[in-house]
């Protein structure tokens, strides 16, 4: 999915107003220290790409991301703002049901959602001049 | 805990170069921007600009270009600003700052350092 | 650039009522705007982000309403320690701006 023609202004506001609460409670009783972040991104089509990545796509040592709160509210926001996002995830989500598994919070997965925190970070300030 | 720790104070003569330090700790210092803001005696806050120690990227204001350079040492977590060809308009109280966890806010700041440019 | 305009520059207030300092911008900054209070001989501190956000330890007593390029941070009653220099802040477009900052005294 090309990412150009969301509504960033409304994508940013819905992640301030919740999204970030739900990654701060995940991360909860982790050391700010912890984790280095290693998935960088460039504008906000690019990071939103990297953000549905991540918190989408099933990744060895953690597989279960799409069925976090903040995970639903992303994809909420994606399907509101970004037009015709909603049909390119049917088939994912479909997919998706079939391997449902039980949600376990390991480290690996407190690392994937210490890097959404920071590709958000970038989203919401993009350091590029036009943004 | 998270702290932003910077170099003394300065005093230099006009037309010479000035490098002030920011070490920081109680973070992972490669994931959060540093900015860089001054305050001239009685005066406002005025933006320098930002780097990102993850990268090296920077975004600086236009009236600091050239003259201010943004860096940052991951081994030892520290950000620096350099600015040359000072100038008597360049007295100031410097403070680093840290982005917030929203990138939306400074939350962290330094203690500030003092550089006078005097002849 | 965009210009962030303060106004009142200095309000004195009786302990416990309320005060009220505006900031409007020169062209919209959409709800990119921070508050900063900066105490006597202190660095700035945070108070409010993206427009109505509390930062955490921040007294419900402040609040932050606004979009586009009128802007408000209110402190519904007044403390000695809220004394010191309030600054808001855009963050929308680059270079990033600050209001003049307004003064604000205890009478």
């Known amino acids: 999915y090309d990412f150009t023609n969301c509504d960033f202004e409304k994508i940013k506001a819905a992640y301030l107003s919740t999204i970030s609460k739900d990654l701060i409670t995940y991360m909860s009783g982790t050391k700010s220290t912890e984790f280095n972040n290693t998935v960088s991104c460039s504008n906000r089509p690019h990071c939103l790409t990297e953000i549905q990545s991540l918190t989408f796509n099933p990744t060895a040592g953690c597989a279960s991301l799409a069925k976090e709160m903040f995970a639903m509210k992303t994809k909420a926001a994606l399907a509101i703002w970004c037009p015709g996002y909603s049909e390119t995830q049917i088939n994912a989500t479909q997919a998706m049901k079939k391997r449902r598994k039980r949600k376990v919070t390991t480290n690996k997965c407190l690392e994937q959602v210490s890097q959404l925190q920071g590709l958000w970070r970038r989203f919401n300030r993009p350091l590029l001049k036009q943004q | 805990e998270v702290q932003l720790v910077q170099s003394g104070a300065e005093v230099k003569k006009p037309g010479s170069s000035v490098k002030v330090s920011c070490k920081a700790s109680?973070?992972?210092?490669?994931?959060?921007?540093i900015e860089w803001v001054r305050q001239a005696p009685g005066q406002g806050l005025e933006w320098i600009g930002v780097?990102?120690?993850?990268?090296?990227?920077?975004n600086y204001n236009e009236n600091f270009k050239g003259r201010a350079t943004l860096t940052a040492d991951k081994s030892t977590s520290t950000a620096y600003i350099e600015l040359s060809s000072l100038r008597s308009e360049d007295t100031a109280v410097y403070y680093c700052?840290?982005?917030?966890?929203?990138?939306?806010?400074?939350?962290?700041w330094g203690q500030g350092t003092t550089v006078t440019v005097s002849s | 650039d965009i210009v962030m305009t303060q106004t009142p520059l200095s309000l004195s207030v009786t302990p416990g009522q309320p005060a009220s300092i505006s900031c409007k911008a020169s062209?919209?900054?959409?709800?990119?705007v921070t508050w900063y209070l900066q105490k006597p001989g202190q660095s700035p501190q945070l108070l409010i982000y993206?427009?109505?956000n509390h930062y955490t330890g921040v007294p419900d007593r402040f609040s932050g309403s606004g979009s586009g390029t009128d802007f408000t941070l209110k402190i519904s009653r007044v403390e000695a320690e809220d004394v010191g220099v309030y600054y808001c802040?855009?963050?929308?477009?680059?270079?990033?701006?600050f209001g003049q900052g307004t003064k604000l005294e205890i009478k």
């Open positions: 993206y427009v109505s």
């Open positions: 802040q855009q963050h929308h477009r680059f270079p990033l701006t």
């Open positions: 700052a840290r982005e917030d966890n929203t990138g939306t806010a400074f939350d962290y």
């Open positions: 109680g973070y992972t210092f490669s994931n959060y921007l």
């Open positions: 780097i990102d120690p993850g990268n090296g990227d920077t």
């Open positions: 062209q919209s900054v959409s709800s990119d």
